[in-house]
Interface confidence: medium
């Protein structure tokens, strides 16, 4: 998360590390008690590594009662999904096991009604992503408020260039933005998932270059199939 | 501490249209939601809809699209709930409460002491 | 649209008893629930969040449990100012409906 600050510690439990050997690859959100959601291209990172999801945390590095890593039983990236592009990015893990829910572990609802979220509305994006175009990578979770950024401007040539389709969505990304590292993880507006980070090697924080975000409402019938 | 002041009782014809206000203090005004909801005499709660000031963004509960419109002064802290083409079935006490934007706190945490809307000829 | 069903309507009882009121959700709401208690021409007081966290200043003989679609609200020894009605309200996504509540009247 470029330009964003330290959140608040387990207010967002719904929020995941997809981790690859012990180690911090991409966000996911819970979705339901054995699911987590995150971007396809995420599992073409981890190569043949052993994939985990760790929920409940705040620091990736320090011991926290709520902390627990769970190993995947299942990836499911959805079939459309392509190595050389960004549409279908998505991805469900179903771990080992139903997650322990509380406080700190919670699935966030996410969005059916397959209607644009209004520009200019602030959604909360939240991550272990780069924290700084040197690559330094926090170790507590950061987020960032950003306003929606409508379709048309984020296709201009100067922008994306028709490169955004109806199932994604666009946030305004000047100075502050989502990053590497942040894949997979949640765009909430209003309390509802409405966007997943999308795992394209986008510049960020360049405002000519929005962050790009995969709609889960445009993917509830797939989403509902694979969790039924 | 954190205190939402609503205005006083309404007493409107039907047809017309009325505004109620929200005043918030004690906290940041654009980090939490306002939402508004409707409680008829002797009946139970129904939940109306939210604002983020922040933003300004809305949501409505279906219901009660078209009834209710939300809004937010910013400069002053305030909220407002503009409520038209009224009818008795409007007569009602509303309240404005507080929900947290990102905390864990997903409930209602603080709230307003309501305002009295009475419709009648 | 999530609906939940609270029971009972009505409940009368007496000083020191031990109550019970639950809330079923028509969907799994994951520990997203509320309990509320009002008092007459009073607003509604949170006294639970997030399905078994008491809020600040709550007494500990309330308590809440529950978990998917089904959730309660108990009260150990009931005191005099107890009596009101208790509303249940889940926060698993718009709207965020309330349950039809529940009457504690003194016996």
């Known amino acids: 998360i470029l330009g964003g600050r330290e959140a608040e510690a387990h207010a967002r439990p719904y929020m995941a590390s997809v981790q690859v050997n012990g180690e911090h690859l991409c966000g996911g959100v819970l979705v339901a008690e054995q699911w987590v959601l995150s971007a396809a291209h995420c599992l073409e990172d981890a190569a043949d590594g052993k994939v985990q999801v760790l929920l409940g945390a705040h620091s990736l590095s320090q011991p926290e009662p709520s902390k627990r890593l769970y190993d995947v039983l299942r990836a499911v990236p959805h079939p459309d999904s392509r190595p050389d592009t960004i549409d279908h990015d998505l991805l469900l893990l179903q771990l080992s096991e139903k997650a322990t829910l509380g406080p700190a572990v919670r699935p966030l609802p996410w969005q059916r009604v397959d209607r644009d979220v209004e520009p200019g509305t602030l959604c909360d994006v939240a991550g272990w992503g780069i924290v700084s175009h040197a690559g330094r990578r926090p170790d507590r979770l950061q987020h960032v408020l950003l306003p929606v950024l409508d379709r048309a401007t984020c296709n201009r040539r100067t922008h994306h260039d028709g490169a955004i389709t109806q199932r994604m969505m666009c946030a305004e990304s000047n100075r502050r933005d989502s990053c590497k590292g942040d894949s997979g993880g949640p765009l909430v507006c209003g309390g509802v998932l409405e966007g997943v980070v999308t795992s394209g090697s986008r510049v960020c924080g360049n405002r000519k270059k929005p962050g790009i975000y995969t709609r889960v409402a445009s993917y509830a019938a797939w989403i509902d199939s694979v969790l039924a | 501490q954190v205190q939402l002041q609503q205005s006083g009782p309404e007493l409107v014809k039907p047809g017309a249209s009325v505004k109620i206000s929200c005043k918030a203090s004690?906290?940041?005004?654009?980090?939490?939601?306002i939402n508004w909801v409707k409680q008829r005499p002797g009946q139970g709660l129904e939940w109306i809809g939210w604002i983020f000031p922040g933003s300004g963004s809305t949501y409505y509960n279906e219901k009660f699209k078209g009834k209710a419109t939300l809004t937010v002064d910013k400069s002053s802290s305030t909220a407002y709930m503009l409520l038209s083409s009224l009818t008795s079935e409007d007569s009602a006490v509303y309240f404005c409460?507080?929900?947290?934007?990102?905390?864990?706190?997903?409930?209602?945490?603080?709230w307003g002491q309501g305002t009295s809307v009475t419709v009648s000829s | 649209d999530i609906q939940m069903t609270q029971s009972p309507a009505s409940l009368s009882v007496s000083v020191g008893e031990t109550v019970t009121i639950t809330c079923r959700a028509s969907e799994n709401i994951y520990s997203n629930l509320a309990w509320y208690q009002q008092k007459q021409g009073k607003s509604p007081q949170l006294l639970v969040y997030?399905?078994?966290n008491l809020a600040d200043g709550v007494p500990s003989r309330f308590s809440g449990s529950g978990s998917g679609t089904q959730y309660s609200l108990k009260i150990n020894s009931l005191q005099s100012e107890d009596f009101g009605n208790y509303y249940c309200q889940h926060f698993w996504g718009t709207p965020y409906t309330f349950g039809g509540g529940t009457k504690l009247e003194m016996r």
């Open positions: 997030v399905a078994t």
């Open positions: 409460a507080r929900t947290g934007y990102y905390s864990n706190l997903y409930a209602v945490d603080y």
């Open positions: 004690g906290y940041s005004f654009t980090d939490y939601y």
